[in-house]
Interface confidence: low
């Protein structure tokens, strides 16, 4: 949209001279601009490219006899070079140029620190045409300035493929100090020195720093920013902050807590997840880490048995994932288990002790005196043995497992039988004649199957043979016996 500012015509002289005007600190108003009688100044906005002049409806008169005139070099008129103002104030500044009417299609753009200002900036270009020249005034306004508006602003005009550049206008926005580095929270060792850093900038400079510990100033004389505070050591938690001062006032940093590293709290909630005959899987919830990362944990295991010597087994493990499988335990035993974890300062107290039990183990010895003989009349093999001397930890005997392997003419077949715990003999049917039968027996408890006895072999002849001599477990160290009938 084009907005016209209509004023009553006043008798001003022609407009080739320098524009009057001055810029006020913290706020500038658009200059009142002279114009010749018969011309009305038009304020031109570009709806598509703010900051570019909109010349579509403005007639800049041609000078047809341009060849006969010597035109002076074009240049922007000098204006205020430096504007200082406080944050959140408004500012307006401009550049102006008189352009002979011979030139057409002039465009003015604003640049800040070498980059063109496009988009939603408040730029207005006004045109004041006369018989021979047109005065062009480009204004730039910023409402509620911020530090980011600091910089060097220039106008550029493109005319007949030539670029004309104005002198820079330096905008300096002053405000309260702005922190570029604030102190950070730390976890420190008791009575050990550490450093805190604070840095703030203006403008205006200089910026002075005061340090504050637990609401009390640490330094009586301020230090110029940046400042490093060396704390010789603390015995208890403290909160530090820094104050940054300049001519505009004071800014306070965030308060940071300095924690004193301590030994961790004991773990809690030790839980049993799984028990076997010789292992227990536990988990725990770590306690408070004492402001220092956990390094590792120690699982302490005591056998709960009046006859045990009360020694403690210690298993070291990583601090994560708060689980450990305790191994090398006795079967059918009661244990008291505690967990302690350490950080760089030391070990926590032990967690509350919990009771856990291992399950029955498998027997550790095989049945004794295994004897095998053929009862041909009933086509059976008789097997006899003696109950093994099992330890209490193996649990209650629930039975026996009998393995008998039949080998004949290169063919081998294994069969398994289960018999009850009250038995010390068994009969198995002859599977194949003219074959070797190899028998082994193992004791079974709820904890599992124990070792098998040494193999006893017996030869099963073809039908009609008579000898029924037994085969039996050999003495230790002897070769496997083979009884051929």
């Amino acid at each position: 949209a084009i907005t016209e500012a209509r004023e009553e015509a006043k008798p001003y002289p022609l407009f080739p001279g320098p524009l009057p005007g001055s810029l006020q600190t913290d706020h500038t108003s658009l200059l009142s601009l002279p114009h010749t009688s018969g011309y009305q100044p038009a304020l031109m906005f570009s709806p598509t490219q703010p900051g570019r002049p909109y010349t579509g409806n403005v007639a800049i008169p041609r000078v047809t006899s341009a060849g006969s005139k010597l035109l002076p070099p074009l240049a922007f008129k000098h204006t205020v070079g430096h504007i200082i103002l406080s944050e959140h104030k408004d500012v307006k500044f401009n550049c102006s140029i008189s352009v002979p009417n011979i030139y057409q299609d002039t465009t003015i753009s604003w640049w800040k620190d070498g980059k063109e200002l496009l988009g939603a900036h408040h730029a207005i270009t006004q045109f004041y045409p006369d018989d021979e020249v047109t005065a062009i005034i480009a204004s730039f306004s910023i409402t509620s300035v911020q530090r980011s508006d600091n910089g060097s602003y220039i106008c550029k005009m493109k005319i007949n493929n030539e670029e004309i550049v104005s002198d820079p206008i330096y905008i300096e926005v002053q405000g309260l100090p702005h922190f570029t580095k604030q102190p950070e929270s730390m976890n420190v060792t008791r009575n050990t020195a550490f450093n805190l850093t604070c840095q703030a900038v203006g403008p205006p400079e200089p910026v002075n720093i005061f340090w504050v510990q637990n609401s009390s100033r640490v330094n009586e004389q301020p230090e110029k920013s940046p400042s490093v505070l060396t704390v010789p050591g603390l015995t208890e938690m403290a909160v530090f902050s820094c104050e940054a001062h300049n001519d505009k006032g004071l800014t306070v940093s965030k308060g940071v807590q300095i924690n004193i590293k301590a030994i961790p709290s004991p773990p809690t909630e030790v839980s049993i997840h799984n028990s076997t005959a010789h292992s227990i899987l536990i988990s725990w919830v770590p306690g408070f880490d004492g402001y220092s990362p956990f390094r590792n944990c120690s699982v302490q295991v005591k056998e709960v048995d009046p006859l045990s010597n009360g020694s403690v087994m210690i298993f070291n493990t990583s601090a994560s994932p708060h689980m450990y499988q305790i191994k090398q335990l006795q079967a059918l035993a009661n244990y008291s288990i505690g967990v302690s974890c350490m950080n760089e300062i030391g070990w926590s107290a032990v967690s509350p002790w919990i009771l856990a039990s291992t399950t029955e183990g498998a027997p550790s010895v095989a049945p004794l005196n295994v004897t095998v003989f053929l009862n041909e009349s009933r086509d059976n093999v008789d097997i006899r043995w003696m109950k093994p001397l099992t330890k209490r930890q193996a649990g209650e005997l629930v039975g026996y497992r009998i393995s008998h392997v039949w080998q004949s003419a290169g063919i081998s077949k294994e069969l398994l039988e289960e018999v009850g715990q009250n038995n010390s003999r068994a009969q198995i049917s002859v599977q194949v004649h003219n074959a070797t039968c190899t028998v082994r027996i193992a004791a079974v408890t709820k904890g599992g199957v124990g070792p098998f006895s040494d193999p006893v072999k017996i030869f099963i002849p073809a039908h009609g043979w008579v000898d029924h001599a037994p085969s039996s477990t050999p003495a230790p160290g002897n070769a496997d016996p083979v009884l051929i009938i």
Epitope: T268, E269, S271, I272, H273, N274, L281, V285, P286, S320, P321, M323
Partner: antibody, heavy 122, light 106 residues
Framework: QVTLKESGPGILQPSQTLSLTCSFS??????????VGWIRQPSGKGLEWLAH???????YYEPALKSRLTISKDSSKNQVFLKIANVDTADTATYYC??????????????WGTGTTVTVSS | QIVLSQSPAILSAFPGEKVTMTCRAT?????MHWYQQKPGSSPKPWIY???NLTSGVPARFSGSGSGTSYSLTISRVEAEDAATYYC?????????FGGGTKLEIK
């Protein structure tokens, strides 16, 4: 985005073995702290935790069902499996798999699958 | 085994009312977790580690408790809160769920 999807046979007969698969995306079971669990819910009844497996291959089972349950994983395929042996009509339920959130001092099921319905019927 | 008992089994409330459901454990647990389930949907984590609301849970929900007694409270019930809420402990294997409290809106 983390998602989990259960799949199973739908219907099977008593004494058969139920095989369930949980296929997931958005996380890896090779990463520290990751776990996946199985929970079931008979129609109109409450939830029952069955088993779960951690990234380091530790496995935990509901003690009353432990002898029938087997949980396993294939981290490269982003899958977790549950087998229930010797099923009975009491195993008829919707079976869910869920990712476990591993906090510093707590754990909970933070993302659940949509569930797969399993019917055991002769 | 830690048994979790939820009460009441069914809770009826008018919109805008304040309601509280409880979960009691037969042994002490460190944290309680709560899940919301609507018919035909899978459970959703609702409150974890006793009092932390999961992302997207309205601030009218809160959790509290310790030891063997925990509760879930809704300060002003809305129609969308109608669901069954389950408590769950992860302190001791087996990791049990409560039987659920069904919240009905009148």
């Amino acid at each position: 985005q983390v998602t989990l999807k259960e799949s199973g046979p739908g219907i099977l007969q008593p004494s058969q073995t139920l095989s369930l698969t949980c296929s997931f995306s958005g996380f890896s079971l090779s990463t520290f702290g990751m776990g996946v669990g199985w929970i079931r819910q008979p129609s109109g009844k409450g939830l029952e935790w069955l088993a779960h497996i951690w990234w380091y291959d530790d496995k935990y089972y509901e003690p009353a069902l432990k002898s029938r349950l087997t949980i396993s994983k294939d981290s490269s395929k982003n899958q977790v499996f549950l087998k229930i042996a010797n099923v009975d009509t009491a195993d008829t339920a919707t079976y869910y798999c869920a990712r476990i959130y591993y906090g510093t001092s707590y754990r909970y099921f933070d993302v659940w699958g949509t569930g797969t319905t399993v019917t055991v019927s002769s | 085994q830690i048994v979790l008992s939820q009460s009441p089994a069914i809770l009826s409330a008018f919109p805008g009312e304040k309601v509280t459901m409880t979960c009691r454990a037969t042994s002490s647990v460190r944290y309680m977790h709560w899940y919301q389930q609507k018919p035909g949907s899978s459970p959703k984590p609702w409150i974890y580690a006793t009092y932390n609301l999961t992302s997207g849970v309205p601030a009218r929900f809160s959790g509290s408790g310790s030891g063997t007694s925990y509760s879930l409270t809704i300060s002003r019930v809305e129609a969308e809160d109608a669901a069954t809420y389950y408590c769950h402990q992860w302190s001791s294997n087996p990791y049990t769920f409560g039987g659920g409290t069904k919240l009905e809106i009148k």
